[in-house]
């Protein structure tokens, strides 16, 4: 079944942008001016998820790349990774659970909770130039709030 998708950029609540760091990792850092063109453009898709009153299930792909953010166990710890997929089959309404994030919007701020690992969130560090990761705490040192902006193609 077809899915609703959009193109967007994400910035954390400290206004750090997300950029590629090697082929399979994202990092967060402050960008200005022409450097803003480095930030990754996501293709966010509305997918099937578990019933909820305040969470909207989405998948986060990298625009025009066959890469999706996914959540897997590595060394017994929930971990965020970029995973290659067959572009002929993605995005799809029924995404595998590791690709699904529950988007939670509060006061124009977005959180992305892993559907596979409840209470684990896409996170950034306070420090500059650090990897984007899956964090198991909210409201602590690490940042779990993001803003989204559409990207015009």
């Amino acid at each position: 079944a077809p899915v609703r998708s959009l193109n967007c950029t994400l910035r954390d609540s400290q206004q750090k942008s997300l950029v590629m760091s090697g082929p399979y990792e994202l990092k967060a850092l402050h960008l200005q001016g022409q450097d803003m063109e480095q930030q990754v453009v996501f293709s966010m898709s509305f997918v099937q998820g578990e019933e909820s009153n305040d969470k909207i299930p989405v998948a986060l792909g990298l625009k025009e790349k066959n890469l999706y953010l996914s959540c897997v166990l590595k060394d017994d710890k929930p971990t965020l990774q970029l995973e290659s997929v067959d572009p002929k089959n993605y995005p799809k309404k029924k995404m595998e659970k590791r690709f699904v994030f529950n988007k939670i919007e509060i006061n124009n701020k977005l959180e992305f909770e892993s559907a596979q690992f409840p209470n684990w969130y896409i996170s950034t560090s306070q420090a500059e130039n650090m990897p984007v990761f899956l964090g198991g705490t909210k409201g602590g040192q690490d940042i779990t709030d993001f803003t989204m902006q559409f990207v015009s193609s």
């Epitope: 609703r4 509305f46 989405v58 559409f150």
Partner: antibody
Framework: EVQLVESGGGLVQPGGSLRLSCTVS????????MSWVRQAPGKGLEWIGI???????YYASWAKGRFTISKDTSKNTVYLQMNSLRAEDTAVYFC?????????????WGQGTLVTVSS | EIVMTQSPSTLSASVGDRVIITCQAS??????LSWYQQKPGKAPKLLIY???TLASGVPSRFSGSGSGAEFTLTISSLQPDDFATYYC??????????FGQGTKLTVL
């Protein structure tokens, strides 16, 4: 305060074209999706389509081809281009804001603009 | 495309009555359903989203329930301001968003 104001409605001949505008304030089109909905006289609500970013628009099956939604974020304005108009397109046309991205529901509406298709 | 069917199409009731409007989807939409109220010459107003969550500023006499393909809107004690037309809306079925045909609530 969230405000949406439609304009551009009026009388148009069958086969003609019309472009409606929806100018918004109190929020940014760079982070909210916008739908167009119409209501024929004495009839129910009919969803036309929705726009996210400029490349991501979705339409009701009956609207594909004749109706096009676009936007100019710098002007805080969303447009509905209507072509090959027919008498049955006579309706009040509303723009509406999606409450949250992909929520589908609409928490802010304009007052509507009347389009009459008649010779 | 998913078709939304409301019943009844018209409903007459008195102030203080308990009123129930139903909405049926042609296939399961989980809890992706909203309800709107519309008065003549006015824009619709969002009442309930995700089948049961009250929108901001909506009185608690309104409630929604259901999941899958069967949904209800209940007004526990009808007030004079509640006479209007009510619409259900599928918000999550694929790329398309569809309204029911409406239920007109009139004074008995």
């Amino acid at each position: 305060e969230v405000q949406l104001v439609e304009s551009g409605g009026g009388l148009v001949q069958p086969g003609g074209s019309l472009r409606l505008s929806c100018t918004v304030s109190g929020f940014s089109l760079s982070s909210y999706a916008m739908s167009w909905v119409r209501q024929a006289p004495g009839k129910g609500l009919e969803w036309i389509g929705i726009i996210y970013d400029s490349a991501s628009t979705y339409y009701a099956s009956w609207a594909k081809g004749r109706f096009t939604i676009s936007k100019d974020t710098s002007k805080n304005t969303v447009y509905l281009q209507m072509n090959s108009l027919r008498a049955e397109d006579t309706a009040v046309y509303f723009c509406a804001r999606e409450r949250q991205i992909f929520s589908g529901d609409m928490d802010g509406w304009g007052q509507g603009t009347l389009v009459t298709v008649s010779s | 495309e998913i078709v939304m069917t409301q019943s009844p199409s018209t409903l007459s009731a008195s102030v203080g009555d308990r009123v129930i409007i139903t909405c049926q989807a042609s296939q399961s939409i989980d809890n992706w359903l909203s309800w709107y109220q519309q008065k003549p010459g006015k824009a619709p107003k969002l009442l309930i989203y995700r089948a049961s969550t009250l929108a901001s500023g909506v009185p608690s006499r309104f409630s929604g329930s259901g999941s899958g393909a069967e949904f209800t809107l209940t007004i526990s004690s009808l007030q004079p301001d509640d006479f209007a037309t009510y619409y259900c809306q599928n918000t999550g079925g694929g790329v398309s968003i569809a309204f029911g045909q409406g239920t007109k609530l009139t004074v008995l």
